[in-house]
């Protein structure tokens, strides 16, 4: 997260880190005791999932292996549409005050809505500085019409933009797949943006979760 702040401890109990060994690969969101939602571009052969701590690499955090993941069947490595994936944990998480599932959206929030994005991604760009603490940034949803002024045809119908006018605050390397939460519901998953990160008036681009609720529920049900 560029130009963000340290998240209030325990305020993001649904936030997970997808690790490759002990190294951060992507963010993710707990949606059920067996399931984590993340970006399709975060796919790996297997994952080490850290839950229940704001510190990356925390020894006291829950760590669960995941060997199965299900990309949206419409994910395109060319256009990056449908950049969403479910990761099935090999064993269920132990829910607690530190580990909770996020609330999936009942509706799509409108432009102007205040949201928070979080992650352990680099706080500087293009040179990287990875924080140990979970970082947050407060952003507002931007209309597709406004966002298309920047990204033109790169912006797909189920992509969502967020940012703050004239501000550098944005997501960056390592934040991918992490949550954009608005009014206590998951509205976005970090997908992409311009580089170096934090260029003012270049919004962050997210997968618009409200458009995928049915796919999420059906996939979890199919692979129970």
């Amino acid at each position: 997260i560029i130009d963000g702040y340290k998240c209030k401890e325990g305020s993001h109990p649904w936030q997970v880190a997808l690790l490759k060994g002990n190294q951060l690969h992507c963010g993710g969101v707990l949606v059920d005791k067996y399931w984590v939602l993340t970006a399709a571009h975060c796919k790996m052969g297997q994952y080490q999932v850290q839950l229940g701590s704001d510190k990356i690499g925390d020894q006291s955090a829950q760590k669960i292996k995941a060997t199965k993941s299900f990309r949206h069947p419409g994910y395109s490595t060319k256009t990056h549409v449908n950049d969403i994936m479910l990761v099935r944990l090999d064993e269920p998480v132990k829910m607690s005050s530190k580990v909770e599932a996020v609330q999936l959206p009942e509706h799509c929030e409108p432009p102007g809505t205040s949201c928070t994005v979080s992650g352990w991604g680099t706080t500087t760009s293009p040179d990287v500085t990875f924080p140990s603490d979970l970082m947050c940034s407060d952003v507002k949803l931007i209309s597709s019409r406004e966002c298309k002024k920047v990204y033109k045809d790169l912006l797909g119908k189920t992509m969502l933009c967020a940012g703050i006018p004239d501000s550098k605050t944005n997501t960056c390397n390592g934040d991918s797949g992490g949550p954009l939460v608005c009014n206590d519901t998951l509205q976005g998953l970090v997908s992409w943006g311009t580089y170096p990160c934090g260029q003012p008036n270049d919004p962050g681009v997210y997968t618009q979760v409200c458009k995928y609720k049915r796919w999420v529920m059906e996939t979890m049900k199919t692979h129970r």
Epitope: Q23, M44, H80, S125, G174, S191, W192, Y195
Partner: antibody, heavy 122, light 108 residues
Framework: QVQLVQSGAEVKKPGASVKVSCKAS????????IHWVRQAPGQGLEWMGS????????NYAQKLQGRVTMTTDTSTSTAYMELRSLRSDDTAVYYC???????????????WGQGTMVTVSS | DIQMTQSPSSLSASVGDRVTITCRAS??????LNWYQQKPGKAPKLLIY???SLQSGVPSRFSGSGSGTDFTLTISSLQPEDFATYYC??????????FGGGTKVEIK
């Protein structure tokens, strides 16, 4: 030191295969994609394809589809490009390059290997 | 696929000259165009990304401009080490990534 180091020059006969390696160091290999670009003698640059080091997702140039395979070995931070059924017009310098960006999209090549000369001759 | 056309294909100039190279895309690529310098026997080196942003470590005599379909690389005062071949590429509609044909800058 952030770098991409490629394998040495190769001489191959028409119809043979070649496998070029590209070893990354100084950065997190699995967080970036590796692209392959070639340059025939005295000619311009031609994009061949790309591979995501973490997912293994590949995209290949249409004209090389079926003849090229890109792979990675994350344990050694090495990318490989294999080209089969070699022809004389495959004689070129082959470069690996890192694409800079984050998340699903990348925007430019900010790091290149030194190049590997592949000569196809009977 | 988007075609990239560079002009001129070669030019002769003297040290201290202002040099301009153009790159035209077959359709709009917004500002997602990059410029590279390549010297004989060496790999290309990034100069400009996003049409106008100077890559770290690149001298300020290099500048880029343009958006949509027409782009320009300018060397304000040509230095001896600038004699090389210059390429543009587009990362807008990818894959494939497409390169311009190159412009060779030679000593007059």
């Amino acid at each position: 030191q952030v770098q991409l180091v490629q394998s040495g020059a190769e001489v191959k006969k028409p119809g043979a295969s070649v496998k070029v390696s590209c070893k990354a160091s100084g950065y997190t290999f699995t967080s970036e994609g590796i692209h392959w670009v070639r340059q025939a003698p005295g000619q311009g640059l031609e994009w061949m394809g790309s591979i995501s080091a973490s997912s293994g997702d590949t995209n290949y140039a249409q004209k090389l589809q079926g003849r090229v395979t890109m792979t990675t070995d994350t344990s050694t931070s090495t990318a490989y490009m294999e080209l089969r059924s070699l022809r004389s017009d495959d004689t070129a310098v082959y470069y690996c390059a890192r694409a800079a960006g984050y998340g699903a999209r990348h925007w430019y090549f900010d790091l290149w290997g030194q190049g590997t000369m592949v000569t196809v001759s009977s | 696929d988007i075609q990239m056309t560079q002009s001129p294909s070669s030019l002769s100039a003297s040290v201290g000259d202002r040099v301009t190279i153009t790159c035209r895309a077959s359709q709009s690529i917004s500002s997602y165009l990059n410029w590279y310098q390549q010297k004989p026997g060496k790999a290309p080196k990034l100069l400009i990304y996003g049409a106008s942003s100077l890559q770290s470590g690149v001298p300020s005599r290099f500048s880029g401009s343009g958006s949509g379909t027409d782009f320009t690389l300018t060397i304000s005062s040509l230095q001896p080490e600038d004699f090389a071949t210059y390429y543009c590429d587009q990362f807008y509609s990818t894959p494939p990534i497409t390169f311009g044909g190159g412009t060779k800058v030679e000593i007059k």
